[in-house]
């Protein structure tokens, strides 16, 4: 047989025995001659170094580049590959020689009393026990012990090959301490040398330190660090630690194997480092190394040692937090301290407790911030050992994107009479106040709610061509007043007004307010009519159970068929900012009302009377008139508000008081209610009559008693009455001091 690649024009060495395999008997002589084209050498089994005394390699007598290998009295151990090769090349010819020695069928390694077989427990792996044979066709089995087990070739994963040895899946013999091969020849058993079975595992999956990070202690405390190595099975582990003062007196190291679940393919080892009475010099990096021999893994953690317990705020602690309404706000308590402090949060001095809207812990979390959350938050850190306290104030400012108050009025806006001057208003609430409020406009017919226009929440208006009010060409002449600031419902609001100097064309107006956190807008439908005009009789908002008339007046020569309607409820929900359908184009939502027609010289007047108005009568009333020539419908809308009846209530500063003679008393009694109540004053249950010293002003709201005299002393009552009843408040006025001599006794008696 030949091995290697032929190099330039060099033939392989030629052996005198032209066979791949040669079988000879023990005690005979083996002689092979090798001829070639340059210097040759021989290699033979068991002694590749050429120092074997029994083997003789001689130059041939009949030529150059020829060597003969001779072994007299061969033994079983001479079985193997004999190789003739050119020096310094791979070109070689090989013959495998079996020396049949039935007394020693297995080839023994020269120096070995026993061999070693390394295996892993992997189910897929096979191991070869190198019991080579001096006879090619032996019946060989493998014996393993203890307990004793015999494995016989099965033509599959268990086999024996004279040149290779016995092949078997490694897990089958992983239990065994030793194995050997056995051959049966003529009922006689022959054994190979013993092979010690070493189950090899080396892989370390990971090394984990516990605690893994953030280890803090103060001087004198005990440090306990656990280092766990997870490995494959059959692994032994060496642990080692590296730390700042490795020659520590009070150090203790304990290594042990941890129990793992049966069937687990993993083993756990634990090394515990304990230092009693830690010192500042022990601060630093602690590293644990685990090593199996073939693999080393390390992990580290930093141990911080403090001189004594302490607490302080970290440099990153905020003093101002800004948020927008609806956001989640997180204010972390950034601290340095050992041990970790107790943390308590306060708002304006009141302790905060966690609930579904707020979580007060290491981080103060407000789930959905609202305006009322604005304020000063104090976090107090307390060291649990030293009881040292540190406090820090965080101001939370909650911003509000612009909200336009009138936006809630979704119903159709009143129609406006042609040629009149009108004022449109946007009342904006925003924090911080809007840095600008801009007005825009567009002709009504360019922005009708046609079905072809898709209205979405993100783009609620089909109107796209908004123009600045500065450019009022083709529209109404406009003037924007300077923004006003007003306290409305306890909130500072910005009021922007737009004055339409003459209502000539129907249009839509939009006010847009912007601040640092958002924008808000309101669209106002400004429908101009030359048609009928609606007036209210009496000209004020009615209260429940009062009567009111709505008059619709139209020029008789221009209009006919005057009719009153009430606008039914709009289909809900209406998208924020969605424009109502022009009333005249959608008569389906109108309810026809009974009314009475009157006429004068030029006009028809259709009067719709509401007797005993109720809250249900509130709403939008539509007067519809038809142009006599064009038959085009004109409609006017008026929103009617019916005020709820409210029994009288009194507010004001009526309190018992003591006054000196000659001074003045001023008290007020503010009453509210609907209908507005009448106010009356009584002294000692008698109606108080005005005279030079007693003055009642502002519908009896304010009472002034000038230059009080002793007889002004008494019980004063303010009573507010309406059809719904009366409310009253009382106060006793004491008058002190001396008057004229004649009254001295009386005065003394009073005291």
């Amino acid at each position: 047989a030949s091995v290697g690649l032929p190099s330039v024009s060099l033939d392989l060495p030629r052996l005198s025995i032209q066979k791949d395999i040669l079988t000879i008997k023990a005690n005979t002589t083996l002689q092979i001659t090798c001829r070639g084209q340059r210097d040759l050498d021989w290699l033979w089994p068991n002694n590749q170094s050429g120092s074997e005394q029994r083997v003789e390699v001689t130059e041939c007598s009949d030529g150059l580049f020829c060597k003969t290998l001779t072994i007299p009295k061969v033994i079983g151990n001479d079985t193997g590959a004999y190789k003739c090769f050119y020096r310094e090349t791979d070109l070689a010819s090989v013959i495998y020689v079996y020396v049949q020695d039935y007394r020693s069928p297995f080839i023994a390694s020269v120096s070995d009393q026993h061999g070693v077989v390394y295996i892993t427990e992997n189910k897929n792996k096979t191991v070869v026990i190198p019991c080579l044979g001096s006879i090619s066709n032996l019946n060989v089995s493998l014996c393993a012990r203890y307990p004793e087990k015999r494995f016989v070739p099965d033509g599959n994963r268990i086999s024996w090959d004279s040149k290779k040895g016995f092949t078997i899946p490694s897990y089958m013999i992983s239990y065994a301490g030793m194995v050997f091969c056995e051959a049966k020849i003529n009922d006689e058993s022959y054994q190979s040398i013993m092979y010690i079975v070493v189950v090899v595992g080396y892989r370390i999956y990971d090394v984990v330190l516990s605690p893994s990070h953030g280890i803090e202690l103060s001087v004198g405390e005990k440090l306990v660090l656990n280092c766990t190595a997870r490995t494959e099975l059959n692994v032994g582990i060496d642990f080692n630690w590296e730390y700042p003062s490795s020659k520590h007196q009070h150090k203790k190291l304990v290594n042990r194997d941890l129990k793992t679940q049966s069937g687990s393919e993993m083993k756990k080892f634990l090394s515990t480092l304990t230092i009693d009475g830690i010192t500042r010099s022990d601060q630093g990096l602690y590293t644990c190394a685990a090593s199996s021999g073939l693999m080393t893994k390390k992990n580290s953690t930093f141990v911080r040692v403090h001189e004594k317990p302490f607490v302080a705020f970290g440099s990153g602690m905020e003093s101002l937090v800004e948020a927008t309404v609806g956001e989640r706000v997180r204010i972390p308590a950034k601290y340095l301290g050992y041990p970790p402090p107790e943390i308590k949060w306060y708002k304006n001095g009141i302790p905060l407790e966690s609930n579904h809207t707020i979580k007060a812990g290491h981080v103060l979390t407000i789930m959905e911030v609202s305006e009322r959350d604005t304020g000063n938050y104090t976090v107090i850190l307390t060291n649990p050992i030293s009881k040292e306290k540190q406090s820090h104030v965080v101001s939370l400012v909650v911003y509000v994107p612009p909200q336009i108050g009138e936006k809630s009025l979704i119903s159709p806006v009143d129609s406006y009479q042609y040629g009149t001057t009108q004022t449109l208003t946007c009342t904006v609430y925003a924090i911080p106040p809007p840095h600008h409020i801009h007005w825009y406009w567009q002709l009504e017919e360019e922005c009708a709610n046609e079905p072809s226009h898709a209205v979405s929440v993100t783009n609620p208006y089909p109107c796209e061509e908004w123009r600045s009010v500065e450019d009022f060409q083709g529209g109404n002449k406009i003037e924007v007043n300077k923004n006003q600031f007003a306290l409305i419902e306890g909130k500072n609001k910005t009021v922007s007004t737009l004055v339409i100097q003459a209502a000539n064309v129907s249009a839509l107006y939009k006010c847009e307010a912007v601040n640092k956190v958002g924008r808000g807008e309101r669209v106002i439908s400004f429908h101009v009519t030359r048609g009928p005009e609606i007036t209210l009789q009496p000209d004020m908002q009615p209260t429940e159970q009062e009567s009111v008339s709505l008059w619709c007046t139209a020029d008789r020569s221009t209009f006919e068929n005057l009719t009153w309607y009430k606008l039914g409820p709009q289909p809900l929900p209406i998208h924020v900012g969605e424009l109502p359908t022009p009333v005249c184009k959608n008569l389906d939502t109108l309810w026809k009302l009974n009314a009475t027609m009157f006429s004068n010289s030029t006009n028809d007047i259709l009067i719709m009377e509401l007797k005993n108005a109720s809250l249900q009568d509130q709403g939008d009333y539509v007067c519809l008139a038809q142009d006599r020539k064009t038959k085009k419908r004109h409609c006017v809308v008026r929103q009617l508000t019916v005020l709820e009846r409210v029994a009288p209530t009194i507010t004001g500063n009526l309190e018992n008081q003591t006054t000196s003679i000659g001074e003045s008393i001023e008290v007020s009694c503010t009453a509210s209610g609907n209908p507005p109540p009448q106010i009356m004053w009584f002294k000692d249950n008698e109606t108080l009559v005005e005279d030079s010293g007693i003055v009642l002003k502002d519908g009896n709201r304010n009472l002034t008693i000038r230059r009080v005299r002793k007889e002004d002393e008494g019980l004063y009552t303010c009573q507010a009455c309406s059809v719904l009843g009366c409310a009253k408040v009382e106060a006793f006025f004491i008058i002190e001091g001396a008057q004229e001599k004649t009254n001295l006794e009386h005065h003394h008696h009073h005291h």
Epitope: D238, A289, G293, L294, T296, K297, K298
Partner: antibody, heavy 117, light 112 residues
């Protein structure tokens, strides 16, 4: 700076013995597994032996099993390879290598062993 | 044992070009932890081997990003982009999936 310096290489007769040393510096020797790797004259690299950080666990290539012994002296930052029953095929340049995660991340410059009669 | 096969010589390459060096294993080096345990070393002339790549594709500390490793369970490639003079030497691959750890015979990087 990590340094590994091998010494002890020599010319030895077949069957003879020799002890190689590797002096380590620039790192905590006792926290790393150590290995010997040899490079044969035909430039092939062959892993020879490995030892765990504390010296309790040793591994050998089949070709040197029973003949070579790897050991370490952590106090002196030194790794050893005792080689007995030397054969001509042991002729090689012997490197000591530092091991972490199974990887040989630093190697020495090597020391040469020649086995010849 | 796992056999690692490498070509003796790479295709000669000109400075600035890219070169691929291949390595084949007789058995998959993909371990059950999902990692592929194959390393690449470079031995420059007159120097000891230096770890370039571990776990098939992770560059060792201080190794230029011109070196990149890739492969499957048994076939692996070391790619060197923009070859420089200092890249000359013998490149070895090594398997760490099964004991004993074995090296390839090495591939010599040839420059035109």
């Amino acid at each position: 700076e990590v340094q590994l310096v091998e010494s002890g290489g020599d010319l030895v007769k077949p069957g003879g013995s020799l002890k190689l040393s590797c002096a380590a510096s620039g790192f905590t020797f006792s926290m790393y597994g150590m290995s010997w790797v040899r490079q044969t004259p035909d430039k092939r690299l062959e892993w020879v032996a490995s030892i765990s950080i504390g010296g309790s666990y040793t591994y050998y290539a089949d070709s040197v099993e029973g003949r070579f012994i790897i050991s370490r002296e952590n106090a002196k930052n030194t790794l050893f390879l005792q080689m007995n029953s030397l054969k001509s095929e042991d002729t090689a340049l012997y490197y000591c290598a530092r091991e972490l995660d199974g990887n040989y991340d630093y190697w020495g410059q090597g020391t040469t062993l020649t086995v010849s009669s | 044992h796992i056999m690692i096969t490498q070509d003796e010589l790479s295709n000669p390459v000109t400075f600035g070009e890219s070169v691929s060096i291949s390595c084949r294993s007789s058995k998959s080096l993909l371990y059950k932890d999902g990692k592929t345990y194959l390393n690449w070393f470079l031995q420059r002339p007159g120097q000891s081997p230096q770890l370039l790549i571990y776990l098939m594709s992770t560059r060792a500390s201080g190794v230029s990003d011109r070196f990149s490793g890739s492969g499957s369970g048994t076939d692996f490639t070391l790619e060197i982009s923009r070859v420089k003079a200092e890249d000359v030497g013998i490149y070895y691959c090594q398997q760490l999936v099964e004991y004993p750890f074995t090296f390839g015979s090495g591939t010599k990087l040839e420059i035109k």
